[in-house]
Every structure is written in C-alpha cells, then in structure tokens.
C-alpha cells in the first residue's frame, strides 16, 4: 500500500479540465476548473497555480482561484494538479487560460486615473482624457466595493482644468475589516468609443482627512494655548497634527507635531467632544502670532502616501507692533 501511495506522489497526474475564466464586479477575475479525468484513485488532489509571470504561486485543494486586478492588460493563470502540497513535486501539464481587457484603442483610454478617500466619507476620483479622444467625450465612472450589492454609477461628474472627475459617498463601516478591502473603479464613455480604464483603490491608502478647525487661542504667562476641532470619523491613534506658529516680530516659523491631546488645562474649554489642545511654549504675548494646523493619517492605520489635509484657516492672537 505504502509503495503504491508513494508512486502516486511521484507519478505526474493528468491535467485539469474545463478551465474557464469570468469577471465579477468590475475587477474580480475568477478562474474555475474541474478535477483531471483519470486521476490516480489514491491521490489526494491539490492544484498548483500561478499567474503568467510565475507570480503568486499557490497550492490548494480548491478548484477555483480569484484575483482582484485592474483589467488594463491581459492576465493569464496556469493550473496543474498534483498529489501533495509539496512545491517541489512536478505537477501535471499546466493548462493556461487568459483574459484580455475590453477592446479599444489604448490611446483612447483615460490616463492618471486616481482616487482619494476624503475624510473616510466620500471618494473623489480624477483622470485625464486619453490622447485619441474627442473633446466632447461624456465619461462615466462605475465603482464597486464589498458593502455594495451591485456596481454603481457615479453621478457627480465634474471638470477641473484638464482633469475630469467624479465623487461618490463612501462612508467607513463599523465592520473592522471594511478597510482591508478595496474599491474597484472603471471609467469609460457613454458612446462606447474609448477603451475602458480600471483601477483598484485599497481603502488603507490615499486617505485625506478634513482640515482641523481652530476654535480658540489664548495666552497664559508666556505660553500660547491652542484649541481645535478634530476631523470626524477617525480614531485618535490614526491621526497626528502639525501646528505651525508664525511670529510677526521675530519672523520665526515654528512647527510642532502633536498627538491628539485632551483639553485638561483650565485655560481650555474642557470636555468638548472631539477637540484637541496644545500648549506652545515661550511665545511672546505682545507680538502678533498666527497659527494654522493640518492633519495627517498615521502609517500604522493608513499606508503612507504623503497626503496631509489642507491647512486650517489661520487664527491670530497678540498685537502687531509698530515698525517705529
């Protein structure tokens, strides 16, 4: 018995059958296949698969494999069967099935398609027209993510200079795994003349918080107390603030990084929901001090992509001295 089993391990199995490919949503590509015909009876079938560039090798018992990928270029999967999980075992002859992007002139497809998730409440995508497109092209953006039952069409198409864009509501769901997923995007034209463009936006990247709102500035001795409202929707471990203080007399420009800080000093309006406070030391009260604040997401929560919020409105305190 043992010998037979051993033989079935080294024996090359027949290839899988009926390998087919389909697309779900906008960018979920799914391959399915049937077990090989005439496989060894004492073989516990496993399937070896990898994409055309030998990437993402996988050995698994399932007769399906899926990938979330922007369908801007051809993608192929090769599948073989074997009798163990051992990667060094030679699988059967590999069967390949490819899927090509929708047809069309590549020069007609939109370029620089990118999206930013604003304050975890709406997503704004923008793109440039392709080189081979007429100026009166009417674009449509479609999007899908896990919490939607079907593909949605974005209604708010706009134009900003050379760029076209569209924004749609996308609110962070309490479900802790929500941000581990992605939004699938496709842009095409109403007339079907341009080649569709796809993008996948991970919800852990391209997050831009709203700017903070400065509520109050006050002096106590030589310290400047700053109180501001935090942007909504974020948890405190995911944000930090940059407080910039400019002094008109000394022309100094001080920058402080600040963690969300409780308003515990008597100088602050206390127990106000969603506010943070910071004390800037050694500020001259008899000069004009101008403060502005911006906020950034923490790399441990959202991937680092250098996206700060816009600056808050400036607020000033103190007196501008005469130049005499």
């Amino acid at each position: 018995d043992y010998k037979d089993d051993d033989e079935s391990r080294t024996e090359t199995q027949p290839p899988v059958t009926n390998l087919s490919v389909s697309v779900e949503n906008l960018c979920t590509v799914i391959w399915t296949w049937n077990p090989p015909e005439g496989a060894s009876s004492n073989c516990s079938l496993w399937y070896f698969s990898h994409f055309g560039d030998k990437q993402d090798k996988k050995i698994a018992p399932e007769t399906r494999r899926s990938i979330e990928v922007p369908l801007n270029e051809r993608i192929c999967l090769q599948v073989g069967s074997q009798c163990s999980t051992n990667e060094s075992e030679k699988p059967s002859i590999l069967v390949e099935k490819c899927i090509s992007p929708p047809e069309g002139d590549p020069e007609s497809a939109v370029t620089e398609l990118q999206c930013i998730w604003h304050n975890l409440s709406y997503m704004k995508c923008s793109w440039l027209p392709g080189r081979n497109t007429s100026p009166d092209t009417n674009y449509t953006l479609y999007y899908w993510h896990r919490s939607l039952e079907k593909i949605h069409q974005c209604e708010n198409i706009f134009r900003e200079g050379q760029y076209f864009g569209c924004s749609f509501d996308l609110t962070k769901v309490k479900d802790s795994s929500f941000e581990q997923h992605s939004v699938q995007i496709m842009v095409k034209d109403n007339a079907g003349k341009i080649k569709p463009s796809f993008n996948i936006v991970p919800l852990t990247s391209r997050v831009k918080p709203d700017p903070p709102h400065i509520k109050n500035l006050s002096f106590h001795n030589d310290d400047l107390y700053v109180q501001w409202e935090n942007p909504q929707n974020f948890i405190s471990r995911c944000l930090f603030y940059e407080v910039e203080v400019n002094n008109s007399q000394t022309e100094t420009h001080n920058v402080f990084y600040v963690q969300e800080a409780k308003c515990e000093n008597p100088e602050f309006e206390r127990n106000v929901e969603n506010t943070s406070c910071f004390m800037v030391p050694g500020v001259l009260p008899d000069t004009l001090n101008t403060v502005r604040i911006r906020v950034k997401t923490n790399k441990l929560c959202y991937e680092d992509d250098k996206l700060w919020s816009n600056w808050s409105q400036e607020m000033s305190i103190g007196k501008k001295r005469n130049s005499t």
């Epitope: 405190s236 471990r237 940059e242 963690q259 800080a261 409780k262 950034k296 790399k299 441990l300």
Partner: antibody, heavy 118, light 104 residues
Framework: EVQLVQSGAEVKKPGESLKISCKGS????????IGWVRQMPGKGLEWMGV????????RYSPSFQGQVTISADKSISTAYLQWSSLKASDTAMYYC???????????WGQGTLVTVSS | EIVLTQSPGTLSLSPGERATLSCRAS???????LAWYQQKPGQAPRLLIY???SRATGIPDRFSGSGSGTDFTLTISRLEPEDFAVYYC?????FGQGTKVEIK
C-alpha cells in the same frame, strides 16, 4: 515628566518563557503607542512592534510576528513583551519607548537585558 | 520593505568640526516619518530629530535635520565632546545600521 521604567535583567534557559514589563508615567498612557526595540550585543536597533494601550491594537514587524507577544494593561499603565519559548538568539537588550503617531520613539525606557544560555 | 542605508559607517572628526551624516531610503518616504537618534555606550537611544527637521525637546540647536524623498541628512554644526556616539536614522519599522562618530 514622561518616564518609562522597565523591569530588571533576566537570565533564562532556552525553551523557558519570559514576560518583561514597561511602566509609563507622566502622560496619558492610553493615548500613545508603546513600542519595543531590540538591540543584540554590539549591533544596531531593530523595530519589533507596537501596541496602542487605548484599545490594545498591535502591529508587529514581519521579522518578529509570531516570535513574541506584545500586550498592555492600561489600568496599571504597563506594557509587556513576552516569549513562550526562548532561544539563545533572543539574547539582547530590549527597550520600550513611547511611539507617537508620527512614528518616532520620543521617550525611552532604560532597557532590559535578557540573557538566554544553557 | 524600505531599507535605510547610513553613510559613512564611521566618521572620525575633532571637537569643533562639522559632522554631516547621511541616510538614504530605498524608495521615497514621507519626511514626516524620518527621525534621528543618538546612542552612547550603555545608554538608551535619545531622539534628536523627528519629521526630518524638527528638533526634539531639549536638543541643542547645533543638531539639525534636512532632506526629503530618499535623501536625508543630520548635521552637527560644531561637535562637542559629548556628541561622540552612534547615530541612527529611522522610518517607522526600519532603522538604519548606524553611523559612529568618533574622536579623531
């Protein structure tokens, strides 16, 4: 004054378990991440992982994932680093440090020397 | 995974001289996350610079940081005897291998 005070030096045998501690004071312990950094004898600094005591959310460096466990007890403002089965290669100085959201370690503990030898 | 490479490995200088330490990232990083530390023998590291250019509390102004993208620099304008130590750059989960500043 912000302070992080670590537990004392440990001498252990391979295969033994160990839990070292880091007590924070002088700031809101639940509002800042606490990180652990390893320094093997004569070598550089290695980022092991961090914990946010406010909700015990942890992140590990891939090199240390599954090798150690980071935990915290916010009621006593203390973070922990533990091993279930020590190896000789775990011999090192371990530092805890406060880790603000902008990702630098701004206050450090004095270090805990862990020696693993048969 | 980002790799930080520090150069030179050792810098031999005299007190009063200017020290320039380099930290190069394998890919572009946000300067918000770049920090510099000083470590003396038998001591814990000490934060000098965060956000690539902001001095930490209590750090003398002879220490300054600059740079963006992939190239960052720590400058000590005039070396004091207490500045001879090992210096590390760091970006979140990654530390550079260190530069030792020793007395010539």
């Amino acid at each position: 004054e912000v302070q992080l005070v670590q537990s004392g030096a440990e001498v252990k045998k391979p295969g033994e378990s160990l839990k070292i501690s880091c007590k924070g004071s002088g700031y809101s312990f639940t509002s800042y991440w606490i990180g652990w950094v390893r320094q093997m004898p004569g070598k550089g600094l290695e980022w092991m992982g961090v914990i946010y005591p406010g909700d015990s959310y942890t992140r590990y460096s891939p090199s240390f994932q599954g090798q150690v466990t980071i935990s915290a007890d916010k009621s006593i403002s203390t973070a922990y680093l533990q091993w279930s089965s020590l190896k000789a290669s775990d011999t090192a100085m371990y530092y805890c440090a406060r880790f603000p959201n902008w990702g630098s370690f701004d206050y450090w503990g004095q270090g805990t020397l862990v020696t693993v030898s048969s | 995974e980002i790799v930080l490479t520090q150069s030179p490995g050792t810098l031999s200088l005299s007190p009063g001289e200017r020290a320039t330490l380099s930290c190069r990232a394998s890919q572009s990083i946000s300067s918000s996350y770049l920090a510099w530390y000083q470590q003396k023998p038998g001591q814990a590291p000490r934060l000098l610079i965060y956000g690539a250019s902001s001095r930490a509390t209590g750090i003398p102004d002879r220490f300054s940081g600059s740079g963006s993208g992939t190239d960052f620099t720590l400058t000590i304008s005039r070396l004091e005897p207490e500045d001879f130590a090992v210096y590390y750059c760091q970006q979140y989960e990654t530390f550079g291998q260190g530069t030792k500043v020793e007395i010539k």
